[in-house]
């Protein structure tokens, strides 16, 4: 087992979290994808794309919007009007079923705090790009907490963008607990998805 790096991001209530999940490989373009929150030992799926996932077709579930861009291998996740109770650990996954999802990146530890009311916003800080680069080696990583550049006096409508550029993605197989995850290769995952797809077809024919 290995510990995945967690990244901690702190925002004020009312802000929008925007995450770009980079799935890179064409074989995942039409795979169903999900945005999930870890609650105890089991992830809670908050929003899923359609199955198969449609290109540039926003799916909205409450305050969450998912949009899959096949041509660039990016899934955009937006969580608007963040609330204190949204705080927690989130992941972008290729969704199979609740007990078997494939994490695209290291989890995001989101901390939402009460904002100070009536504080004027700084326009140059209202939108911010925070890049997270996934590890490219299958070695154990201790938890690492990185706060984005401080958003001082950010207005409620400000957007924080979290992006994850990476040369090679590490895909992980979520078992029971977020901190105990087995790193698997793209090739292993590809074979797993193919075999599951075959099983799915056999069950329906």
């Amino acid at each position: 087992t290995t510990e995945l790096t967690e990244e901690k991001y702190e925002y004020k209530e009312g802000q929008t979290l925007e995450v770009k999940c980079d799935y890179t490989l064409e074989k995942f373009a039409s795979s169903q994808k999900a945005w999930q929150k870890m609650e105890g030992k089991m992830p809670k799926i908050l929003a899923k794309t359609e199955r198969p996932s449609k290109n540039s077709h926003p799916v909205q579930v409450g305050r969450i919007t998912l949009e899959d861009y096949h041509d660039h291998g990016l899934l955009q996740v937006q969580m608007t009007n963040l609330q204190v109770e949204d705080s927690g650990l989130y992941q972008c996954v290729i969704y199979q079923h609740p007990k078997e999802s494939h994490v695209l990146f290291n989890p995001i530890c989101l901390v939402v705090t009460k904002g100070s009311s009536g504080t004027p916003g700084s326009s140059e800080n209202s939108t911010q790009n925070v890049y997270r680069t996934p590890s490219t080696t299958a070695k154990a990583l201790g938890p690492r907490y990185t706060s984005p550049r401080t958003v001082t006096q950010a207005p409620p409508e400000s957007t924080v963008v979290v992006s994850t550029p990476g040369s090679e993605i590490n895909l992980t197989n979520v078992t029971d607990i977020i901190r105990e995850q087995k790193l698997i290769s793209e090739e292993d995952l590809e074979q797993k998805l193919i075999s599951e797809e075959d099983l799915h077809h056999h069950h329906h024919h």
């Epitope: 074989k27 861009y69 291998g73 990016l74 992006s163 090739e187």
Partner: antibody
């Protein structure tokens, strides 16, 4: 270890045809788009085209300079990509490199050593 | 097609000094917050070697004296302290749109 080996280069007359091969190993070939890039002697790099994967219906894209004359194909069972070059011109003389990207619209992390194509009468 | 223009065409820098190469795109090569712009190094008789991907990410195994920056249409490759082995031709390349395109190259030499 990822390896790309080009073959099939040689001397051909203007108007002639040639088929280049790129044998791949060390990775799951069917997973990645494959590209061809060429370089005339003493000149810069020119992207020739790419072929995507089965999940993208093996879609192909080409540079304007070769469109209609060159065809890229692949055989996933043989881990090989091909560049069929027809109606060759003297300006097609170059070293042809096979490259593998890192995924959708990603960078070229792996290159072959290249094969020389000379178009001359 | 997106045209990439590198400057200068050639550059002579003393050992240990900083070398800077620019790449300007005729239109943005960004999608969302990603710049699909990459840098390669090519030495005589060898295929190109990836140095920087997506504008600013250092490829594994590449010395950290190499760095990339920029977004949209303007990008820079910097070598903080030139070494003898850095003599080569450097190319930028965009993959944001088909057809993919390369810059014309910048030849880097020792002064």
């Amino acid at each position: 270890e990822v390896q790309l080996v080009e073959s099939g280069g040689g001397l051909v007359q203007p108007g002639g045809s040639l088929k280049l091969s790129c044998a791949a190993s060390g990775f799951t070939f069917s997973t990645y788009a494959m590209h061809w890039v060429r370089q005339a002697s003493g000149k810069g790099l020119e992207w020739v085209g790419r072929i995507r994967t089965k999940s993208s219906n093996y879609a192909t894209y080409y540079a304007a300079s070769v469109k209609g004359r060159f065809t890229i194909s692949r055989d996933d069972s043989k881990n090989t990509a091909y560049l069929q070059m027809n109606s060759l011109k003297t300006e097609d003389t170059a070293v042809y490199y096979c490259t593998r990207d890192m995924g959708i619209r990603r960078q070229f992390a792996y290159w072959g050593q290249g094969t020389l194509v000379t178009v001359s009468s | 097609d997106i045209v990439l223009t590198q400057s200068p065409d050639s550059l002579a820098v003393s050992l240990g000094e900083r070398a800077t190469i620019n790449c300007r795109a005729s239109e943005s090569v960004d999608t969302f917050d990603y710049s699909f712009l990459h840098w390669y190094q090519q030495k005589p008789g060898q295929p190109p070697k990836l140095l920087i991907y997506r504008a600013s990410n250092l490829e594994s195994g590449v010395p950290d004296r190499f760095s990339g920056s920029g977004s949209g249409t303007d990008f820079t490759l910097t070598i903080s302290s030139l070494q003898a082995e850095d003599v080569a031709v450097y190319y930028c390349q965009q993959s944001n749109e088909d057809p993919y395109t390369f810059g014309q190259g910048t030849k880097l030499e020792i002064k």
